[in-house]
């Protein structure tokens, strides 16, 4: 028998992916075990095998179809169970009633880009995906800017409450490099979370023109 | 609706190697647990091996432990199962099966199956 304090979290990403992470101390490494989802009111099912992270943690995918398709809705509830193999038996470790729009997390965006960068400034844009359409406008961004001798935690973030999929960033240094990075949270669900930050955009200011007056 | 296609099938004998391979379409593959099963002439189909959604944990019935060997590469969207010292009792219609849930992929009822390839082996 597995002894200790177990966590189960799950996130759906709006379409057709619900992430799980299962912590289990004093679990064995070496032991299968598996996610089982169970719709209310849906006719699949689906597992997937959980795989060690670090000592004591694992994670796995519930790949519910294609990377696009809405296949959950506001009113579905998951039946999710942590499901471990002792000898010839499964045992359920965890259970929750997973509500998918209570429990977001969406992917992060993805194709940033630099639309036009000056000396003091820059704009960028950048795309979400798999998102539901459910959502419509109801979505709010944070960015950062990454600046020469700090790190991402010191940079302050900037918040867009509402669904604007670009950016002007001001009072930049000319001729400098830079690092910018976005992440997306839908406003419904009670346990929702922001998305994993986007990869870096990497740019670089104009530099100041010499000779001009300022 | 997820296609699945088994190749790789042929004559033996004794003592030798095949290796079947299942190409599997229309849906995404790494959903899938993956199975095989087998069909002599006159008896049920039955279970051989069981591969998970990750390809991590794999499971065999009995009489093929140790000579057969199930994997699959997610990224061609196949499932292989390669089988050394075959015996005239492996004589069989071997087929590929996937479904969504591996705690029901041993029950027949609710899977996908390819069409089947042939395996003889002779004494």
């Known amino acids: 028998a597995v002894n200790g304090t177990s966590q189960f979290t799950c996130f759906y990403n709006s379409r057709a992916n619900i992430s799980c992470v299962w912590s289990q101390d004093g679990a064995l490494q070496d032991t299968s075990c598996q996610v089982h989802a169970w719709p209310d009111r849906r006719r699949w099912n689906q597992t997937c095998e959980l795989l060690p992270v670090s000592q004591a943690s694992w994670a796995c995918n519930l790949i519910l179809g294609a990377p696009d398709s809405q296949k959950l809705t506001t009113v579905d509830i998951v039946t999710l169970r942590v499901l471990c193999r002792e000898g010839v038996r499964w045992r359920v470790m965890a259970i929750q009633d997973f509500k998918p729009f209570e429990n977001l997390r969406l992917m992060a965006p993805i194709s940033l880009q630099v639309v036009h960068v000056e000396t003091h400034r820059c704009n960028i844009s950048w795309e979400i995906s798999q998102a539901s359409h459910y959502f419509e406008r109801h979505l709010e961004f944070e960015a950062r800017t990454l600046s020469p001798g700090h790190t991402w935690e010191e940079a302050p973030l900037l918040t867009l409450k509402q669904k604007q999929e670009w950016i002007c960033l001001e009072t930049l240094t000319p001729d400098t490099q830079y690092e910018f990075q976005v992440r997306v949270k839908p406003l419904q669900g009670e346990f929702t979370t922001w998305s994993p930050w986007s990869q870096p955009l990497a740019f670089r200011t104009k530099p100041a023109a010499l000779g001009k007056d300022t | 609706q997820v296609q699945l296609q088994e190749s790789g099938g042929g004559l033996v004998q004794a003592g030798g190697s095949l290796r079947l391979s299942c190409v599997v379409s229309g849906d995404v593959f790494v959903r899938y647990t993956m199975a095989w099963f087998r069909q002599a002439p006159g008896k049920e189909r039955e279970f051989v091996a069981v591969?998970?959604?990750?390809?991590?944990?794999?499971e065999y019935v009995d009489s093929v432990k140790g000579r057969f060997t199930v994997s699959r590469d997610n990224a061609k969207n196949t499932v292989y199962l390669q089988m050394n010292n075959l015996k005239p009792e492996d004589t069989a219609v071997y087929y590929c099966?996937?479904?969504?849930?591996?705690?029901?992929?041993?029950?027949?009822?609710?899977?996908?199956w390819g069409q089947g390839t042939q395996v003889t082996v002779s004494s």
């Open positions: 099966a996937a479904n969504t849930d591996y705690f029901q992929i041993r029950s027949v009822d609710n899977n996908a």
């Open positions: 591969v998970t959604d990750s390809g991590r944990t794999t």
